[in-house]
Interface confidence: low
């Protein structure tokens, strides 16, 4: 079973998936659609790196631009380094300014 077939089988269960499952899924060439991504638990999405989200969404990663003001994308952006977000070429704004030392990412959630 290839990645896309596997994704179709588990799609309906993904809403409550933990971060570990999403990280594993990102390695399987699943090309998750934006509608599914937007239904994921915010706390599960937040720890994902830019590279992991890029792999998870595949060609659908461009959809992050249209969803940048909505959760969980908005909250995820706030936790990423702007340098890393810039590598996507989508013009996503709101990441941690380049050069800032990140002391406690959980603090950002309280401030946002």
């Amino acid at each position: 079973m290839n990645g896309s077939e596997y994704f179709v089988k588990i799609q309906s269960f993904l809403g409550g998936a933990p971060t570990e499952d999403l990280k594993a899924l990102s390695q399987q060439n699943v090309s998750m659609d934006l509608a599914t991504f937007m239904k994921l638990r915010t706390d599960a999405v937040l720890p994902l790196t830019v590279a992991e989200v890029q792999k998870l969404l595949g060609p659908h990663v461009e959809g992050l631009k249209a969803e940048e003001r909505h959760r969980p994308v908005r909250d995820w952006i706030l936790r990423q380094r702007q340098d890393d977000l810039d590598t996507l070429g989508l013009g996503l704004q709101g990441g941690i300014p380049n050069g800032y030392l990140v002391l406690d990412l959980s603090m950002q959630e309280a401030l946002s």
Epitope: S31, G58, P59, E62, G63, K65, A66, L90, G91
Partner: antibody, heavy 120, light 109 residues
Framework: QLQLQESGPGLVKPSETLSLTCTVS??????????WGWIRQPPGKGLEWIGS???????FYSPSLKSRLNIAVDTSKKQFSLKLSSVTAADTAVYYC????????????WGQGTLVTVSS | EIVMTQSPATLSVSPGERATLSCRAS??????LAWYLQKPGQAPRLLIY???TRATGIPARFSGSGSGTEFTLTISSLQSEDFAVYYC???????????FGQGTKLEIK
């Protein structure tokens, strides 16, 4: 009803810059749901993706053309543009502008195309 | 770059008969494949996307199938307006690097 209309010179000299504009009517160029793209087709040949631009200005280019290419958007004029520098006869083609949903890389609506010939 | 190869280059079929066009990708494109129809002097028109979903206004005689690297466009009963050139296109790459097949010309037998 959405309409895409390409415009620009039909003849460009070798080594010069090819400049085309696509005007969007009957729809919003500022929609967050779409990218706006350029595709070309040399006479009697197949289709080649050139690049795409989002209303924010974020653009993506074909790797083979990237060094010579600039695609920009002017939302106030409801237009997006293509500039291809240092052209040769190999750049002679019908150039199409098209709409692309942000969720995928397909092109769901096309302009009628404009032929650009590179010749001295 | 993902190379898309279409076969045959030309297909001769009689009106009312079934036509089967093939498209092969040099590596997996998942289900991110589209088909377009182009008539002489006209822009391409989107027929199928996501391998098997018909675009708005496309008749049910057009159907798509496949996944990964092998894809098929089937026209169940050819009408006179279906004779044209058909292109497949993959959109499974990031950053975007969309590639088209070289086309299959469907002609009247």
């Amino acid at each position: 009803q959405l309409q895409l209309q390409e415009s620009g010179p039909g003849l460009v000299k070798p080594s010069e810059t090819l400049s085309l504009t696509c005007t969007v009517s009957g729809g919003s160029i500022s929609s967050s749901s779409y990218y706006w793209g350029w595709i070309r087709q040399p006479p009697g040949k197949g289709l080649e993706w050139i690049g795409s631009v989002y209303y924010s200005g974020s653009a993506f280019y074909s790797p083979s053309l990237k060094s010579r290419l600039n695609i920009a958007v002017d939302t106030s004029k409801k237009q997006f543009s293509l500039k291809l520098s240092s052209v040769t006869a190999a750049d002679t083609a019908v150039y199409y502008c098209a709409r692309r949903p942000y969720k995928s890389g397909l092109f769901d609506f096309w302009g009628q195309g404009t032929l650009v010939t590179v010749s001295s | 770059e993902i190379v898309m190869t279409q076969s045959p280059a030309t297909l001769s079929v009689s009106p009312g008969e079934r036509a089967t066009l093939s498209c092969r990708a040099s590596q997996s494109v998942s289900s991110n494949l589209a088909w377009y129809l182009q008539k002489p002097g006209q822009a391409p028109r989107l027929l199928i996307y996501g391998t098997s979903t018909r675009a708005t206004g496309i008749p049910a005689r057009f159907s798509g199938s496949g996944s990964g690297t092998e894809f098929t466009l089937t026209i169940s009963s050819l009408q006179s307006e279906d004779f044209a050139v058909y292109y497949c296109q993959q959109y499974n790459t990031w950053p975007p690097e969309y590639t088209f097949g070289q086309g299959t010309k469907l002609e009247i037998k």
